[in-house]
């Protein structure tokens, strides 16, 4: 079971998955760059079924989505943590 734990640590992901998730099952994605007490980048996926998954940033499929998000947000100033709805 993949879960997001909100503990005293700044890192929230205990386990990460590389398993492909179809976009139609995804509600939104949160990308947290390394820093703020967490030494690694974290990607948290909220699914439409209300469950939450931490995704390995090296997973090929999430890299593709992140690239798409980067292109869409390139016209706006970067923020340290951002969430995007997946259409």
């Amino acid at each position: 079971v993949l879960e997001v734990y909100y503990t005293h640590l700044r890192c929230r992901c205990v386990q990460e998955s590389s398993v492909f998730i179809p976009r139609r099952f995804i509600d939104r994605i949160q990308i947290s760059p390394r820093g703020n007490g967490c030494p690694r980048k974290e990607i948290i996926v909220w699914k439409k079924n209300k469950s939450v998954v931490c995704v390995d940033p090296q997973a090929e499929w999430i890299q593709r989505i992140m690239e798409m998000l980067r292109k869409k947000s390139s016209s706006t100033p970067p923020v340290p943590v951002f969430k995007r709805k997946i259409p």
Epitope: V19, F20, P22, R24, F25, N49, R64
Partner: antibody, heavy 120, light 107 residues
Framework: EVKLLQSGGGLVQPGGSLKLSCAAS????????MSWVRRAPGKGLEWIGE????????NYAPSLKDKFIISRDNAKNTLYLQMSKVRSEDTALYYC?????????????WGQGTSVTVSS | DIVMTQSHKFMSTSVGDRVSITCKAS??????VAWYQQKPGQSPKLLIY???YRYTGVPDRFTGSGSRTDFTFTISSVQTEDPAVYYC?????????FGAGTELELK
């Protein structure tokens, strides 16, 4: 134990209609996407369409969306496929399948299949 | 629609052999590919999901690999119970599509 029990198949005349059912047990049916898939004689698997848990999203194979209607009744734990304007090429074994969206994201449980024969 | 092309419709093998079935997607599907086994008179069974992950209870002789457009399903040592039709399936995007299937038979 997860079971998807299918019924409603049989012989139907060209141009006719038929409604297939898929009764689920052993799972929280109302939480899952469900799909219909068919296999015509001598051919491979063909996806018909899928429906999300609350029926707000239904996706069809483009070539089939005008003749098939997918629905579900969560109170009865049952998935349906309404077939209309059937033709001989709709003769196939029809399967319902659970479309997992928690761990695997593929079709992990399948019904036993129900046979539909279109003939005059 | 994304076309999934399985290069062989039939493959003949012997018990103990290593056999690989290939599948090519007409466009990039990342790792959104599953492999199914269907024996005569039975429903399809999920073997591999997300291109390379073995489904619960599937023997470790079955493996999957690949990404983007090229995928491979391998049985490391064919057993007597393995003859079946094997299908690749993309669930990357709607409409979902399957390969035509590869029938594996024993010599």
């Amino acid at each position: 134990e997860v079971k998807l029990l299918q019924s409603g198949g049989g012989l139907v005349q060209p141009g006719g209609s038929l409604k297939l059912s898929c009764a689920a047990s052993g799972i929280d049916f109302s939480r899952y996407w469900m799909s219909w898939v068919r296999r015509a004689p001598g051919k491979g698997l063909e996806w018909i369409g899928e429906i999300n848990p609350d029926s707000s999203t239904i996706n069809y194979a483009p070539s089939l969306k005008d003749k098939f209607i997918i629905s579900r009744d969560n109170a009865k734990n049952t998935l349906y496929l309404q077939m209309s304007k059937v033709r001989s090429e709709d003769t196939a074994l029809y399967y319902c399948a659970r479309q997992d969206d928690y761990d695997y994201y593929a079709m992990d449980y399948w019904g036993q299949g129900t046979s539909v024969t279109v003939s005059s | 629609d994304i076309v999934m092309t399985q290069s062989h419709k039939f493959m003949s093998t012997s018990v103990g052999d290593r056999v690989s079935i290939t599948c090519k997607a007409s466009q990039d599907v990342s790792t959104g590919v599953a492999w199914y086994q269907q024996k005569p008179g039975q429903s399809p069974k999920l073997l591999i999901y997300s291109a390379s992950y073995r489904y619960t209870g599937v023997p470790d002789r079955f493996t999957g690999s690949g990404s983007r457009t090229d995928f491979t399903f391998t049985i490391s040592s064919v057993q007597t119970e393995d003859p079946a039709v094997y299908y690749c399936h993309q669930y990357y995007t709607i409409p979902l599509t399957f390969g035509a299937g590869t029938e594996l038979e024993l010599k």
